[in-house]
Interface confidence: medium
Amino acid sequence: PGPPPGSPRASPDPRAELDSTVLLTRSLLEDTRQLTIQLKDKFPADGDHNLDSLPTLAMSAGALGALQLPSVLTRLRADLLSYLRHVQWLRRAMGSSLKTLEPELGTLQTRLDRLLRRLQLLMSRLALPQLPPDPPAPPLAPPSSTWGGIRAAHAILGGLHLTLDWAVRGLLLLKTRL
C-alpha cells in the first residue's frame, strides 16, 4: 500500500530524475541521427546549412565544467521549443517534398514534445524557478523553393543533433555532481 493519508510524498531521487531525462535525450539524439542519415541519403546537400531563426549553439569550448543545472535546463528547454517549432514548420511547409521522411519526422516531433514535457517536470520536481509562458514567436516564412526547404531541413536536423549532444554531455556531467 502507499503512504498513509496526509504523509508527505517521498521526493524523487534527483539523480534518477536526471538520468531518465538524459536517456530520453539520447533516444531523441539517436532518432535525429537516423533521420539525418536518411535526409543526406535522399536529399544530398554539401556544405554548411544555416537558418537565422535557429537558436545559436549553447555551448562554447571549455564551458562544460562551469555548467549549473538551472541554466542548462532553462536553456535546453528554450532551444528545444525552438526546434519543435521548426520541425512543425518543416512538416507543414514541405509536406509533399519530404513525404518519404514523414513518418520519421512525425515521430521526431512527438519525442521532442515528450522530452520538453519531461524537462518541465524535472524543473518542477527540482523546484527550479518556472519560466513565464513563452511569448508567441513570429511566424516562420515559408521556404522560397523546394531546395530552400531541403537546405532548411539539413540546418534544423544538424542543429538539433549538436544541441542534443551538448545536452547529454552537460546533463551527464551534472548528474555526477549531484
Partner: antibody
Framework: EVQLVQSGAEVKKPGASVKISCKAS????????MDWVKQAPGQRLEWIGD????????IYNQKFTGRATLTVDKSASTAYMELSSLRSEDTAVYYC????????????WGQGTTVTVSS | DIVLTQSPASLALSPGERATLSCRAS??????????IHWYQQKPGQAPRLLIY???NLESGVPARFSGSGSGTDFTLTISSLEEEDFATYYC?????????FGQGTKLEIK
C-alpha cells in the same frame, strides 16, 4: 576512405608528458566526436575521454581527469591527447576512435600509438 | 562504473561451427528503446573493429554471420558459421553511462 592516422611511438621518462596526434580524413570532422582509448598490456580497454570538435568541449573519465587533456585543430582535422605526469602504468597503446555524438561507440579507429614509460 | 563480464574467457572451436559469446552487465544498460551495448573484434597488433552497435545493429561492411541480441543485463554475440578470419578476441562495451567501459574480452581460438 575514412581514416584516422596517429603519430608514432613514444618513449618517455616518469614525470614527463606525451602528446599524441590523430589526423582524420575521408569524413566531415565536425560531424563526429573524437574519443581516446587506452589498452595496457593484459588489461581491458579503458575509455579516457572524448571531445566534440564543433564545440571543443571535452569530457573525461574521472580516472584521467587532471592528467589527460584533449584538444582539436578543426582546420587541420586533427585531434590531440596530452597525458602528463607519466608513470609506469601509463605504458600502453593509445587509440583515437571516431565516436557517434553522445553514443560513445566507436566505428573507426586509429592504428594506435605505443607509449612506453621507463626510467 | 558499470562492470561488464564476458564469458567464456576463451573458446576453442573449428571453422564452420557456431560461436556464442556472452556479456553480462552489473546493471541494466537498456532503456528508452535502446540497449547501449556494442561489440568489437580485435586481432593481435591491430586496433579493435566495431561489429555490432546498440546491441543488435550490424555495422556497415561486417558479414551477416555476425549478430547481436539481448537486453537489460544479458547480451550475446553470435557468429553463425566461423570462418578462419573470425579467430580473434571479442570485446563488449557499454555506453549507458559515463564512463563507457569494456568487458575483459573473449578469445576465440581454432580447435
Amino acid at each position: 576512405e575514412v581514416q584516422l592516422v596517429q603519430s608514432g611511438a613514444e618513449v618517455k621518462k616518469p614525470g614527463a608528458s606525451v602528446k599524441i596526434s590523430c589526423k582524420a580524413s575521408g569524413y566531415i570532422f565536425r560531424d563526429y566526436n573524437m574519443d581516446w582509448v587506452k589498452q595496457a598490456p593484459g588489461q581491458r580497454l579503458e575509455w579516457i575521454g572524448d571531445i566534440n570538435p564543433t564545440i571543443g568541449a571535452p569530457i573525461y573519465n574521472q580516472k584521467f581527469t587532471g592528467r589527460a587533456t584533449l584538444t582539436v585543430d578543426k582546420s587541420a582535422s586533427t585531434a590531440y591527447m596530452e597525458l602528463s605526469s607519466l608513470r609506469s602504468e601509463d605504458t600502453a597503446v593509445y587509440y583515437c576512435a571516431r565516436g557517434e555524438l553522445a553514443h560513445w561507440y566507436f566505428d573507426v579507429w586509429g592504428q594506435g600509438t605505443t607509449v612506453t614509460v621507463s626510467s | 562504473d558499470i562492470v561488464l563480464t564476458q564469458s567464456p574467457a576463451s573458446l576453442a572451436l573449428s571453422p564452420g561451427e557456431r560461436a556464442t559469446l556472452s556479456c553480462r552487465a552489473s546493471k541494466s544498460v537498456s532503456t528508452e528503446g535502446y540497449s547501449y551495448i556494442h561489440w568489437y573484434q580485435q586481432k593481435p597488433g591491430q586496433a579493435p573493429r566495431l561489429l555490432i552497435y546498440l546491441a543488435s545493429n550490424l555495422e556497415s561492411g561486417v558479414p551477416a554471420r555476425f549478430s547481436g541480441s539481448g537486453s537489460g543485463t544479458d547480451f550475446t554475440l553470435t557468429i553463425s558459421s566461423l570462418e578462419e578470419e573470425d579467430f580473434a578476441t571479442y570485446y563488449c562495451q557499454h555506453s549507458r553511462d559515463l564512463p563507457p567501459t569494456f568487458g575483459q574480452g573473449t578469445k576465440l581460438e581454432i580447435k
